[in-house]
């Protein structure tokens, strides 16, 4: 149910792309096509083919994305094209001058001189945005976002963007400015990460990550699965990043038990987070078989 | 830190029954607690936990017979249905080592236990 | 349920001897074992965590270690006081969690 063709608007088509781009990037990271057949791996990158092509139509001039191009570029939705671009750059082929494009507008056009990224085009589609959706701490918790897409860009385009780098510091100096006053467990993990990114996440800022997950296991605000899912899994990236190899199966177990493998209304995030986390878990830790992901893709009927 | 079991009596072959643990010098809002069982003479058994959201794990035998609830920041109640005289035992709770996951950081401390005897 | 096979089942060792006990678990449960003391008539206590850690206030003679799907409680320099039965707690997941039958060590 997660290889899916996209279609629609610029936020739906991301909405569509997202879990086939996150399903082969996991099938490949934990090399388990052959439970599904390896052709079908081909017909997933055609959809992911698709769904970049499309996702073109919705490139504004200066190279940042909306809904629709009759209004006003949105920094998430931007920032969420890069992160989903860079991913799926080591799957299909990727124009660097579009990925980068929306780089240099996330860091020209939308990053203040306090280091923060301002969304002046909010998303329509709210159900894609995750924990963000929540307004509370946004400024910190966009930054991180922004941030984390950067990251995961820098290597495809730090030779095309120069700004990047200081960028990347500067909205890093305002994450450890804030970091000690966050309330959200949501904005403590995906800003621990971002530190964690850029081997900041030490004293005080860890034991005020370490100290925000419940039980030693999540990060968790009542009621929010979804939000849950998706903090958690940005906590185990930095977890990950740290090797602290010690805190991480709790993690995974908690993750692994929730028994969500992506899809549905609003679930844009925590697929995303839920399956790259895993991924990187099965990647970083050896001998991983108490993971036991039951994980089915189908793809659509042609 | 201190818990303790209460509610153990001598009931007839399916009659239903409620343990509770009572703990003291924390609260169960920040805290994991599992409940483990002995028979007379026997090894030690884990029935299951819950988490300090409410959330509950059993063992595979237990699920359906056995209810973990947590019914105040202070008390974890153990419900069981169609007892059989295969339930007699010493009940146990403990809480999570430094309010974790009890099956990865262990469980301390625990309560002295209350033993139930299940008799015709 | 045979996620943990434990041996010996009894054991005995003369003061300042060692004790090994090692618990086999069915499947990789990573460091998902503790190790128990319990003494006649007194709740378990907590020994070891995650496979090896020691926890709070216990002598250092304690030891745990593991070696792939095996798991080894090691008691070094043993006391009158450790005579008691030994038990591993090993979880695959939630579900499938089990003590190990334990062991009843006797100090000569």
């Known amino acids: 149910h997660l290889i899916v063709t996209p279609a629609g608007c610029g936020e739906q088509n991301m909405i569509g792309m997202t879990p086939t781009v996150i399903a082969v990037h996991y099938l490949d990271q934990t090399e388990q096509w052959e439970k599904f057949g390896i052709e079908k791996r081909q017909e997933a990158l055609e959809l992911i083919k698709k769904g970049y092509t499309q996702q073109l139509a919705f490139k504004q001039p200066s190279s940042a994305y909306a809904a629709f191009n009759n209004r006003p570029p949105s920094t998430w939705l931007t920032a969420y094209v890069v992160k989903v671009f860079s991913l799926a750059a080591n799957l299909i082929a990727i124009d660097s001058h579009v990925l980068c494009g929306a780089v240099k507008w996330l860091i020209l056009e939308k990053q203040k001189p306090d280091g923060v990224f301002q969304e002046d085009g909010p998303v329509i589609h709210q159900e894609m945005i995750g924990g963000f959706r929540n307004a509370k701490e946004a400024d910190v918790s966009l930054t991180a976002f922004v941030l984390i897409a950067l990251q995961e860009a820098r290597d495809i385009c730090e030779g095309q963007v120069n700004s990047l780098p200081g960028s990347i510091n500067k909205a890093g100096e305002y994450i450890e400015a804030s970091y000690m006053n966050l309330q959200r467990p949501y904005t403590v993990a995906i800003a621990g990460y971002a530190l964690a990114l850029m081997n900041k996440l030490e004293e005080p800022y860890l034991g005020k990550f370490l100290n925000t997950a419940k039980d030693r296991n999540r990060w968790e605000e009542p009621d929010q699965q979804l939000y849950n899912v998706e903090a958690t899994s940005y906590a185990l990236l930095a977890l990950l990043l740290l090797k602290d190899f010690d805190s991480v199966p709790p993690v995974v177990r908690w993750l692994n038990e929730q028994r969500y493998y992506g899809g549905g209304y609003g679930s844009t995030q925590a697929t995303f987070m839920v399956f790259q986390a895993l991924a990187q878990y099965q990647t970083d830790v050896p001998d991983h078989k108490d993971l036991n992901m039951d994980v089915s893709f189908h793809l659509p009927s042609r | 830190q201190s818990l303790e079991e209460s509610g153990g009596r001598l009931v007839t072959p399916g009659t239903p029954l409620t343990l509770t643990c009572t703990v003291s010098g924390f609260s169960l809002s920040r805290y994991t607690m599992a409940w483990v069982r002995q028979a007379p003479g026997k090894g030690l058994e884990y029935i299951g936990w819950?988490?300090?959201?409410?959330?509950t794990y059993y063992a595979s035998w237990a699920k359906g017979r056995f209810t973990i609830s947590k019914t105040s920041s202070t008390t974890v109640d153990l419900k069981m249905t169609s007892l059989t005289t295969e339930d007699t035992a010493t009940y146990f709770c403990a809480s999570g080592n430094d309010g974790g996951d009890p099956l990865y950081y262990g469980m301390d401390p625990w309560g002295p236990g209350t033993l139930v005897t299940v008799s015709s | 349920d045979g996620v943990m096979t434990q041996t010996p089942s009894s054991t005995s060792a003369a003061v300042g001897g060692t004790v090994t006990i090692k618990c086999q678990a069915s499947q990789s449960i990573r460091s998902w074992l503790s190790w128990y003391q319990q003494k006649p008539g007194q709740p378990p206590k907590l020994l070891i965590y995650?496979?090896?850690k020691l926890a709070s206030g216990v002598p250092s003679r304690f030891k745990g270690s593991r070696s792939g799907t095996e798991y080894t409680l090691a008691i070094s320099g043993v006391q009158r006081e450790d005579a008691a039965t030994y038990y591993c707690l090993g979880s695959i997941a939630s579900d499938d969690t089990a003590f190990g039958a334990g062991t009843n060590v006797e100090i000569k």
């Open positions: 995650e496979a090896s």
């Open positions: 819950i988490d300090s959201s409410g959330s």
